[in-house]
C-alpha cells in the first residue's frame, strides 16, 4: 500500500477581512493511525491552529466529520478572518504514540487577507495662514492589505501634484498604513475650498474612500480698512465710518481712537457675508466737532483673529469747520495704514 500523503490542494487562498477562510486538506490513507493538527508557520515557533482532540479553538470548525474513523478530509474553516491571520497554514499528520510524533506535513496553504483601509483622516496646520502662503495637509489611512494602494489629493476637484506619500512598513506585514503630506497655496477665495484625500484599494471595488478638510479651518483673510466721512448728521456732528472688508474668520475687534485716545471698542457681530465666504462689517463714530479746538486724528484700529492690530486714520480739520448750521465739514482722509 502506498504511503500516506497529506494533500493541501490550494497553494494560496485570499479572503476578505471578516469572512471565513476554508483551508482544504485530505489524506490518502487511514494508516498510520493518529491525529491531524493544523499549524500556522513552520519550525519550533509554529502556532497551533487546530487540534482535533484537545484545546480550545472557537473560530475553527471542521468541514466534514473529521472524527469518524474512515474520514480522510481534514479541511477546516476559520471564521472572522483578520489581517493578523495571514500566513502559511500546514495540515500535519501525526502517528499515534507516547508521545504522538509528526509523520507527514502538507505543502502548506498561504492565506492572504484583503483588508479595507480605514477612512482617510485629513488634518491641516495647527495655526491659520494667510493667502499666498503654502500650508501642509496630512492624510492617514490604516489597516489595509495587500500593500498596493493609490492616494490622490484634490483641491476643489483639481488634482494636486505637490505631495509625498509613504506606505509603512516597508517589509512584509499583516496590514499596512499610508501617510501623505500635500502642500497647498492659499488664495483669498479659499474660504469655501476643500482639500480632499482620495484612497483607492483593491478591497474598495472602484469606490475610493475620501477624507476632506475645509480650508475655512486653515485660512485667515486679513481685512482691508477704509475710513470715510459722511455728511453732517446734525449741527457740529460728523459721522465717520470704518468699512472692514473681506475678512475671515469673523473674530474681530474694532477700536476707535481720537487723537490716540480710545473712544470706543466693539466686537463684530452683525456682519454681512460675501459670496466667497469672507465677511464685511461697518462701524461708525459720531464726532462732536465743537468739542475740539484743534484738528482731530481719528483712527480705526482692528484686531482680527488675535493678530497684531491694523489701522487706518482720518484727519478731521476742525479749523475748516464753519459754526453755521448746514455748512459742509472740511475733512481729509490721510489713507495711512498703520500696524
Amino acid at each position: 500500500e502506498e504511503e500516506l500523503q497529506v494533500i493541501q490542494p490550494d497553494k494560496s487562498v485570499s479572503v476578505a477581512a471578516g469572512e471565513s477562510a476554508i483551508l482544504h486538506c485530505t489524506v490518502t490513507s487511514l494508516i498510520p493511525v493518529g491525529p491531524i493538527q493544523w499549524f500556522r508557520g513552520a519550525g519550533p515557533a509554529r502556532e497551533l491552529i487546530y487540534n482535533q482532540k484537545e484545546g480550545h479553538f472557537p473560530r475553527v470548525t471542521t468541514v466534514s466529520e473529521s472524527t469518524k474513523r474512515e474520514n480522510m478530509d481534514f479541511s477546516i474553516s476559520i471564521s472572522n478572518i483578520t489581517p493578523a491571520d495571514a500566513g502559511t497554514y500546514y495540515c500535519v499528520k501525526f502517528r499515534k504514540g507516547s508521545p504522538d510524533t509528526e509523520f507527514k506535513s502538507g505543502a502548506g496553504t498561504e492565506l492572504s487577507v484583503r483588508a479595507k483601509p480605514s477612512a482617510p483622516v485629513v488634518s491641516g496646520p495647527a495655526a491659520r495662514a494667510t493667502p499666498q502662503h503654502t500650508v501642509s495637509f496630512t492624510c492617514e489611512s490604516h489597516g489595509f492589505s495587500p500593500r498596493d494602494i493609490t492616494l490622490k489629493w484634490f483641491k476643489n476637484g483639481n488634482e494636486l501634484s505637490d505631495f509625498q506619500t509613504n506606505v509603512d512598513p516597508v517589509g512584509e506585514s499583516v496590514s499596512y498604513s499610508i501617510h501623505s503630506t500635500a502642500k497647498v497655496v492659499l488664495t483669498r477665495e479659499d474660504v469655501h475650498s476643500q482639500v480632499i484625500c482620495e484612497v483607492a484599494h483593491v478591497t474598495l471595488q472602484g469606490d475610493p474612500l475620501r477624507g476632506t478638510a475645509n480650508l475655512s479651518e486653515t485660512i485667515r483673510v486679513p481685512p482691508t480698512l477704509e475710513v470715510t466721512q459722511q455728511p453732517v448728521r446734525a449741527e457740529n456732528q460728523v459721522n465717520v465710518t470704518c468699512q472692514v472688508r473681506k475678512f475671515y474668520p469673523q473674530r474681530l475687534q474694532l477700536t476707535w481712537l481720537e487723537n490716540g485716545n480710545v473712544s470706543r471698542t466693539e466686537t463684530a457681530s452683525t456682519v454681512t457675508e460675501n459670496k466667497d465666504g469672507t465677511y464685511n462689517w461697518m462701524s461708525w463714530l459720531l464726532v462732536n466737532v465743537s468739542a475740539h479746538r484743534d484738528d482731530v486724528k481719528l483712527t480705526c484700529q482692528v484686531e482680527h483673529d488675535g493678530q497684531p492690530a491694523v489701522s487706518k486714520s482720518h484727519d478731521l480739520k476742525v479749523s475748516a469747520h464753519p459754526k453755521e448750521q448746514g455748512s459742509n465739514t472740511a475733512a481729509e482722509n490721510t489713507g495711512s495704514n498703520e500696524r
Partner: antibody, heavy 114, light 108 residues
Framework: EVQLQQSGAELVKPGASVKLSCTAS????????MHWVKQRPDQGLEWIGR????????KYNPKFQDKATITVDTSSNTAYLQLSSLTSEDTAVYYC???????WGQGTTLTVSS | QIVLIQSPAIMSASPGERVTLTCRAS???????LYWYQQKPGSSPKLWIY???NLASGVPARFSGSGSGTSYSLTISSMEAEDAASYFC?????????FGGGTKLEIK
Amino acid sequence: EVQLQQSGAELVKPGASVKLSCTASGFNFEDTYMHWVKQRPDQGLEWIGRIDPADGDTKYNPKFQDKATITVDTSSNTAYLQLSSLTSEDTAVYYCVRGNYVNWGQGTTLTVSS
Amino acid sequence: QIVLIQSPAIMSASPGERVTLTCRASSSVSSSYLYWYQQKPGSSPKLWIYSTSNLASGVPARFSGSGSGTSYSLTISSMEAEDAASYFCHQWYSYPRTFGGGTKLEIK
C-alpha cells in the same frame, strides 16, 4: 447545551476502591479527549490523565499510573475514573473536563476516612 | 515533566489597581498551549485565557495575557471586586499536562 454531569459525593474507607462517573451531553462524545483533574482542599489542580473516547487510548500522569484507571462507555456517553487502594491523600474533589478545557463537570467530592 | 511556578501565591489588590500574575515554566512551552483558569470557592475552574493571550467567552476586556517560552503573565488593568478568585496557569504542550500552584487574588 454542553453538560458534564458527575456522580455524587463518596465517603469510602481506606484501602477500598471507588469508581466516579461523568456523563456527557450536548456534543459528540467521541470528538475530543476527556480528562480527569484532582483538587485537594485549598490546593492546586493536578492532571490525572485523559482518554480518547473514539478508541479508548489513555495517557496518565506517572504520579497516578498505579492509582487511577480511566475508561469510557460510548453507548452511554460516560467516562469513568476508578481509584484504588484509597488513602487520606486521595481525599479531594475530582473533575472531569472535556478536551477543549472549556467544559468542566461540577466535581465529585471523595472523602477517604475510616 | 514541565513544572509551572506561579507567583505570588497570594496577593491583595485595591479596586482600580493594576494586577499582574506570573507563571514560569521549568522548560519552554509553545504559547498556543498555555491556558489560564479562574476559580471561585465552591465552583469548578473556568477557562479564562487560552493560547496565552486570547480571552475566553465572557471574560472582561480588562484582562489580558502575554508571554512566550518559559515566562507568562495574566494582567488585570483595573482590579474589580468580582476579580477576587484563584487563578491557575496550565500547559498541555507535553505529557503529563500540568497546572501551576495557583495565585489567590483578594480584594483590599
